[in-house]
């Protein structure tokens, strides 16, 4: 008799792939543009990234530090009208991209939550949730919740409103905290909350703490669905040197949970390489003309256009990983088992029932190392085969699709491998 298939878990749309944050419409579109109508024209690009949701804004009216002049129900006219927003929603829906609206109230001001008028602001948020849910948004994001007094109880209330409308609606909270205990206390009081934090940004510029941070987090959160990012808003390049970007992309797409990226992460957008650009929201480099301030500052391989034409680029890697993440059961909701492989190496398996399985080996070291895969660390349900097929490497030069002997697996400096192998009874 064939073994019984394992029952599939309930999957919400945000479980099926990455979220893509566009916190600054003007920086994203560039060239003095930056409105909802223009963003609609970029939805095909988002489709090409295979992302499942767009985290947008904030785009509401907000006079810096003035609670009376902050209206969460009104779109700032600089970004467009309610009609523009409705049109964007419709277009996004047609392309199966969900829209999450950021309602962080005082986004232009000093304290995101007008600390002296918390109750007033909380009421405004409540009204806004109901209003925008009726308008058809798929979820909400609120950031800087470490500045919100009694954040846990407010989040629980907002979560009730969101889920009360539909189980298919999402609430994301963001915090600058990297403290695991603080993060856990926020999660404990809010069952389905998706939380973005600076937790992984403590992994160090060499990535030396990544493995322990990830495993600690997963052990602490148990079966709870998590999200993976390095911060609540900033670019990966704010935290990582160039040589770790590919490793982190591979890791974020293959850990159990929802990967969350900021616009530009897919091309390695780096504010430090663009003099005069703000660290938190540099201009998106669509092509070499996107940053005309300093002629020659932008080369083709830094842009969407240039990287789209290069199969070995960071953007091409992002697209491939995003595609795998959204269609393979083992990556969608599979079990996760980390195991020893050697100094500087982080290796883990993702597997679901009798589906194809995935082995990830990440070399955070700046040296070529043989991976001593300690299969004895793994449960019987997740045993390693003698060989696995190379699906992709973060570095060019390997023959993809070829079987690799796991006993003789050697990684280049800062190389990550994604390997696949079939279930064996």
């Amino acid at each position: 008799r064939a073994p019984r298939c394992r029952e599939l878990p309930a999957q919400k749309w945000w479980h099926t792939g990455a979220l893509y944050r566009i916190g600054d419409l003007q920086a994203f579109q560039g060239h003095g543009a930056g409105n909802l109508a223009g963003l609609k024209g970029r939805l095909d690009y988002l489709s090409s990234l295979k992302v499942k949701g767009l985290v947008l804004g904030p785009i509401h009216k907000n006079q810096k530090d003035d609670v009376a002049q902050t209206d969460l129900l009104q779109i700032d006219p600089n970004f467009g009208s309610k009609e523009d927003f409705d049109s964007l929603l419709q277009s996004a829906k047609k392309k199966s991209i969900r829209v999450i609206l950021d309602l962080t109230p005082n986004y232009r001001g000093e304290n995101s939550w007008f600390s002296t008028q918390v109750d007033t602001v909380a009421t405004k948020v409540k009204d806004a949730l109901e209003f925008w849910l009726q308008a058809g948004v798929d979820g909400f994001q609120v950031r800087d919740i470490e500045n919100l007094k009694d954040a846990s109880s407010f989040l629980a209330e907002w979560q009730n409103i969101t889920k009360g409308f539909s189980e298919d609606r999402l609430l994301i909270a963001g915090t600058n905290s990297s403290d695991l205990q603080q993060i856990l206390s926020l999660l404990e009081s809010n069952k389905d909350l998706l939380l973005t934090s600076s937790y992984l940004s403590d992994s160090g510029s060499t990535g030396e703490h990544t493995k322990s941070l990830v495993t600690q987090y997963l052990n602490a959160t148990g079966n709870r669905w998590c999200s993976w990012s390095l911060s609540q808003a900033r670019l990966l390049t704010s935290f990582l040197p160039a040589q770790l970007l590919r490793l982190y992309q591979l890791m974020l797409f293959t850990l159990p949970g929802t990967p969350v990226f900021s616009y530009g992460d897919e091309i390695g957008l780096d504010a430090a390489a663009l003099p005069g650009q703000p660290m938190e929201a540099p201009v998106m480099l669509w092509d070499e003309s996107s940053f005309p301030d300093i002629p020659g500052a932008v080369s083709a391989n830094m842009t969407v256009k240039g990287q789209s034409e290069d199969p070995g680029s960071l953007l091409s890697l992002f697209r491939r990983l995003s595609d795998q993440r959204s269609k393979e059961r083992s990556l969608l909701h599979g079990d996760f088992h980390a195991f020893s492989a050697g100094p500087g190496l982080f290796s883990y398996i993702r597997h679901w029932d009798q589906n194809e399985r995935f082995l990830v080996v990440l070399n955070f070291g700046d040296v070529g190392l043989s991976a001593g895969l300690q299969a004895s660390d793994l449960p019987a349900s997740a045993s390693l085969p003698a060989k696995a097929d190379l699906l992709l490497s973060t570095q060019p030069g390997r023959e993809e699709g070829s079987p690799l002997e796991l006993e003789r697996l050697k990684l280049e400096p800062h190389e990550g491998l994604l390997l696949r192998f079939p279930y064996a009874a």
Epitope: S212, G344, D366, V367, Q395
Partner: antibody, heavy 119, light 113 residues
Framework: QVQLQQPGAELVRPGASVKLSCKAS????????MNWVRQRPGQGLEWIGL????????HYNQMFKDRATLTVDKSSSTAYMQLSSLTSADPAVYYC????????????WGQGTTLTVSS | DIVMTQSPSSLAMSVGQKVTMSCKSS????????????LAWYQQKPGQSPKLLVY???TRESGVPDRFIGSGSGTDFTLTINTVQAEDLADYFC?????????FGGGTKLEIK
């Protein structure tokens, strides 16, 4: 300042084992890799292996894989190398050497332990 | 394993002269991703442990006098000592730090005339 302290000498019998120590001070022990290198009389340098003190993950030169065992004691910031089945080919100066996380070059070295194998 | 070959095995120079020594690797030490060459140079004075001089082929370790200059790429590397001093009497070893097992050259012994 960074220091790696090793005993000056060890005398052991052929076929026996020896456990060499390397006490680190002046830096965060768990933030750097510890390597072991040997130098036989009048010869060059041979890399034996490395250990990451943060999680005790090890990596060995295949030539020493079956005979060398690297360990650490985080509480005393001490690294150890045990070498078993000693023969007349093993007398050498054994150095511990620090490397930044993920790097393969060695920025600080101990003074070395002179190992003598004699019956 | 990557084999490292140094030449000459020894050389004698007078104080103030310029010294060059060579190191060759059996395969390229250039990482095409970051365009760095993974080669280090060490100095070992008599009765002492080795001391790091240069890594990534040309990056001088802090505190090392600027008369020590590392150069080269791919498989061919050179350590140059401009205006050699009496205290430079030592053995000099190159080492590849590209890939495990890390391997050293046989050394060049510098004697002062």
């Amino acid at each position: 300042q960074v220091q790696l302290q090793q005993p000056g000498a060890e005398l052991v019998r052929p076929g026996a084992s020896v456990k060499l120590s390397c006490k680190a001070s002046g830096y965060t022990f768990t933030s750097y890799w510890m390597n072991w290198v040997r130098q036989r009389p009048g010869q060059g340098l041979e890399w034996i292996g490395l250990i990451d003190p943060s999680d005790s993950e090890t990596h060995y030169n295949q030539m020493f894989k079956d005979r060398a065992t690297l360990t650490v004691d985080k509480s005393s910031s001490t690294a150890y190398m045990q070498l078993s089945s000693l023969t007349s080919a093993d007398p050498a100066v054994y150095y511990c050497a620090r490397a930044s996380y993920g790097k393969g070059y060695f920025d600080y070295w101990g003074q070395g332990t002179t190992l003598t194998v004699s019956s | 394993d990557i084999v490292m070959t140094q030449s000459p095995s020894s050389l004698a120079m007078s104080v103030g002269q310029k010294v060059t020594m060579s190191c060759k690797s059996s395969q390229s030490l250039l990482n095409n991703i970051n365009q760095k060459n993974y080669l280090a140079w060490y100095q070992q004075k008599p009765g002492q442990s080795p001391k790091l001089l240069v890594y990534f082929a040309s990056t001088r370790e802090s505190g090392v006098p600027d008369r020590f200059i590392g150069s080269g790429s791919g498989t061919d590397f050179t350590l140059t000592i401009n205006t050699v001093q009496a205290e430079d009497l030592a053995d000099y070893f190159c080492q590849q730090h590209y890939s495990s097992p890390f391997t050293f050259g046989g050394g060049t012994k510098l004697e002062i005339k």
